[in-house]
């Protein structure tokens, strides 16, 4: 019975951007100004989000979709739907409760947000440091130290490792 009733429900015919108006014999009425319905069959329209103060309008509200906000320059969005604004820092810094602080030696941040991360440890991959790291940039790893020995070409790829027990041909 419930299933039959839902199939015959006149409200299910109301498209997005409208609501099923109980006060008008369940006629589909357009959403009033500053409201929207993003799906069909709605009995009410939702109030549009207002991007006020430091929240700027990135996308205007329409009858079928909510407004989208972003943050005034100097801050960036955080949280679902930009529910918060968090301050930017410069590259080479990270945000702490004391404000923006320079990355410690051995760490870097190449963005205006996020935390300082340790430089890549080239030696873990058997490589050498080609370009030193800074607060803003990671190190650049180059060929392994063995590849840089006299007579070796730095552009020649390393020879594939031989399996144990196999002698050179």
């Amino acid at each position: 019975f419930e299933r039959t009733r839902s199939l015959q429900d006149p409200c299910s015919n109301c498209p997005a951007g409208t609501f099923c108006d109980n006060n008008r014999n369940q006629i589909c009425s357009p959403c009033p100004p500053n409201s929207f319905s993003s799906a069909g069959g709605q009995r009410t329209c939702d109030i549009c989000r207002q991007c006020k103060g430091v929240f700027r309008t990135r996308k205007e509200c329409s009858s079928t979709s909510n407004a989208e906000c972003d943050c005034t320059p100097g801050f960036h969005c955080l949280g679902a739907g930009c529910s918060m604004c968090e301050q930017d820092c410069k590259q080479g810094q990270e945000l702490t409760k004391k404000g923006c602080k320079d990355c410690c030696f051995g760490t870097f941040n190449d963005q205006k947000r996020g935390i300082c991360r340790p430089w890549t440890n080239c030696s873990l991959d058997g490589k050498s440091v080609l370009v030193n790291g800074t607060k803003e940039r990671d190190v650049v790893c180059g060929p392994s130290p063995a590849d840089l020995s006299p007579g070796a070409s730095s552009v020649t790829p390393p020879a594939p490792a031989r399996e144990p027990g196999h002698s050179p041909q």
């Epitope: 955080l78 529910s83 918060m84 968090e86």
Partner: nanobody
Framework: EVQLVESGGGLVQPGGSLRLSCAAS????????MNWVRQAPGKGLEWVAN????????YYVDSVKGRFTISRDNAKNSLYLQMNSLRAEDTAVYYC????????????????WGQGTTVTVSS
Amino acid sequence: EVQLVESGGGLVQPGGSLRLSCAASGFTFSSYWMNWVRQAPGKGLEWVANIKEDGSEKYYVDSVKGRFTISRDNAKNSLYLQMNSLRAEDTAVYYCARGGDSYGYRDYGMDVWGQGTTVTVSS
């Protein structure tokens, strides 16, 4: 309704003082870090100072250290910014902003903002 309302802005001469206030309502004020953030004409937002829930920690941007003092009165649901030795470069709209639920743990997002109060430092 969660709300922050700033007051106390105005025109002041260089070297003068002002005290900004922020009245909070609609939430448990004593459970949140609070911030002052400013926006100079034609510039982006700049964080100025923050204060822990119980007032035990306070931090400032370098440019205002020794001149500005942030404080709070949890019994009155109020945040303050005492501004001394004001300079022309302090001219800005000053916003009171609430730290989000994860402020100081996972991030430093601010989720509730006032409408701002204007401070103009000019002779």
